[in-house]
Amino acid sequence: AGVFELQIHSFGPGPGPGAPRSPCSARLPCRLFFRVCLKPGLSEEAAESPCALGAALSARGPVYTEQPGAPAPDLPLPDGLLQVPFRDAWPGTFSFIIETWREELGDQIGGPAWSLLARVAGRRRLAAGGPWARDIQRAGAWELRFSYRARCEPPAVGTACTRLCRPRSAPSRCGPGLRPCAPLEDECEAPLVCRAGCSPEHGFCEQPGECRCLEGWTGPLCTVPVSTSSCLSPRGPSSATTGCLVPGPGPCDGNPCANGGSCSETPRSFECTCPRGFYGLRCEVSGVTCADGPCFNGGLCVGGADPDSAYICHCPPGFQGSNCEKRVDRCSLQPCRNGGLCLDLGHALRCRCRAGFAGPRCEHDLDDCAGRACANGGTCVEGGGAHRCSCALGFGGRDCRERADPCAARPCAHGGRCYAHFSGLVCACAPGYMGARCEFPVHPDGASALPAAPPGLRPGDPQRYL
């Protein structure tokens, strides 16, 4: 057994542009409160029941009235920790949901109005008994800063709160079969403590607080003999006393579900189906009314005026579950285009785009040349996940902004000399060669290999290449 503790440090506008409007005004003063929901395991599926590890509601914070024209500051917070007690082992990995609620204190008919301001969720690994872990989560334009820890309640110790420790009865050593309790070397591991009142003759336990019955006995404390009517559904070995089959110990024996919950066996353990108004692994969290705000994500709570009456959450579109704690899988509609990966962040859908695509739904193809200017008369060519420029003569680089050295590639053949020119390059050919690149030899008889030299040019003149 132990307690999960959550300390809210601040709730206010996050960094960056688009600061949120203050949730309160002079006409509508308000105050904040927080709700935390814990589930065991790292995946949503790990906790079929809502808030299976428990839930807690903070006190209401101080009343806040916005100063006209002032930006939304960090808002005044409720005092104290949010504490979620857990009766069984701490799972080590858990999922959390923290909701920030606003209670408007204007003159509404029917009392204060509640609305959900922000909701953050996450999955974490945490060992019980460790130091406070700090966290920052953002929901839209809001930012929530908080710390959390899990601590064991004595006599439980360890990272899962499953080991029990007692002060040593003798100063030198622990009892037979019991080890010292690290790091509390002055204490000893204690034998398992079964559920209070569990029959020492007919009951036993494998977990603290449990009471499992030996053959022939039943009831929450294993004090009731099994009647012969139980022979109708045999499961265990024959009983010598009654001469019929009686159930052997099973996970639902003694009904671990509290508050009228019904128990059903699962391959590894059991599952409680809780009546309305109760939740938790064993339906042990009780007394929830609409005043406690049990409906997440803006769900509307109906009924449940007192702890004995049931409440029902009417969920807004996109949410489901008995407490509106589960989000509908909106990504299954595949809104992201061009192979983008869909992420449901709760307040919005986001698409993680493949290379070469951009936009909220990856709808923009970066390969197209729209809006991509190539300088100095270059032309844009599509392909390869990014635009490419085919540059005009004398220019180079990604956007044709760099002036190219036309002589760098040594374009003049047969020892011709290259000169850079504003419109290209000029080759001054060595004796015996001619042509734009000095590529044609001049024959000994004075005739060129060309059919004819252009008028006005003699062999050996520099050839200007346009």
């Epitope: 996109g318 809104p335 859908l349 739904r361 990856c362 709808e363």
Partner: nanobody
Framework: EVQLVESGGGEVQPGGSLRLSCAAS????????MGWYRQAPGKQRELVAG???????IYAESVKGRFTISRDNAKNTVYLQMSSLRAEDTAVYYC??????????????WGQGTLVTVKP
């Protein structure tokens, strides 16, 4: 603000057919993805059929060959033709749309749902 209005639900016998319609209306918007989800009592809401952002058609495995989704772009409407209906198709059917608004932002909208009951 965009509204999605479903119609066409009702009670039908096993093997029968129904045609659901979902019309989108509101100020300037364009539809990116649109389709149908359903939620049976005590179950999670699941996608039945839809047009994806890439305009592909997708179907849940359990309805392939029996349900057909179609659309009329001019009317901003999608249809779900359901045939060979079974008892396990009984659910509230919700229209859903991922929409680009005039502001260029995208929003995901849900209809209020229409009940389909399949029983002898």
């Amino acid at each position: 603000e965009v509204q999605l209005v479903e119609s066409g639900g009702g009670e039908v016998q096993p093997g029968g057919s129904l045609r659901l319609s979902c019309a989108a209306s509101g100020f300037t918007f364009s539809i990116n993805a649109m389709g149908w989800y359903r939620q049976a009592p005590g179950k999670q809401r699941e996608l039945v059929a839809g047009f994806t952002g890439d305009t592909n058609t997708i179907y849940a495995e359990s309805v392939k060959g029996r349900f057909t989704i179609s659309r009329d772009n001019a009317k901003n409407t999608v249809y779900l033709q359901m045939s060979s209906l079974r008892a396990e198709d009984t659910a509230v059917y919700y229209c859903a749309a991922d929409v680009q608004l005039f502001s260029r932002d995208y929003e995901f909208y849900w209809g209020q749902g229409t009940l389909v009951t399949v029983k002898p």
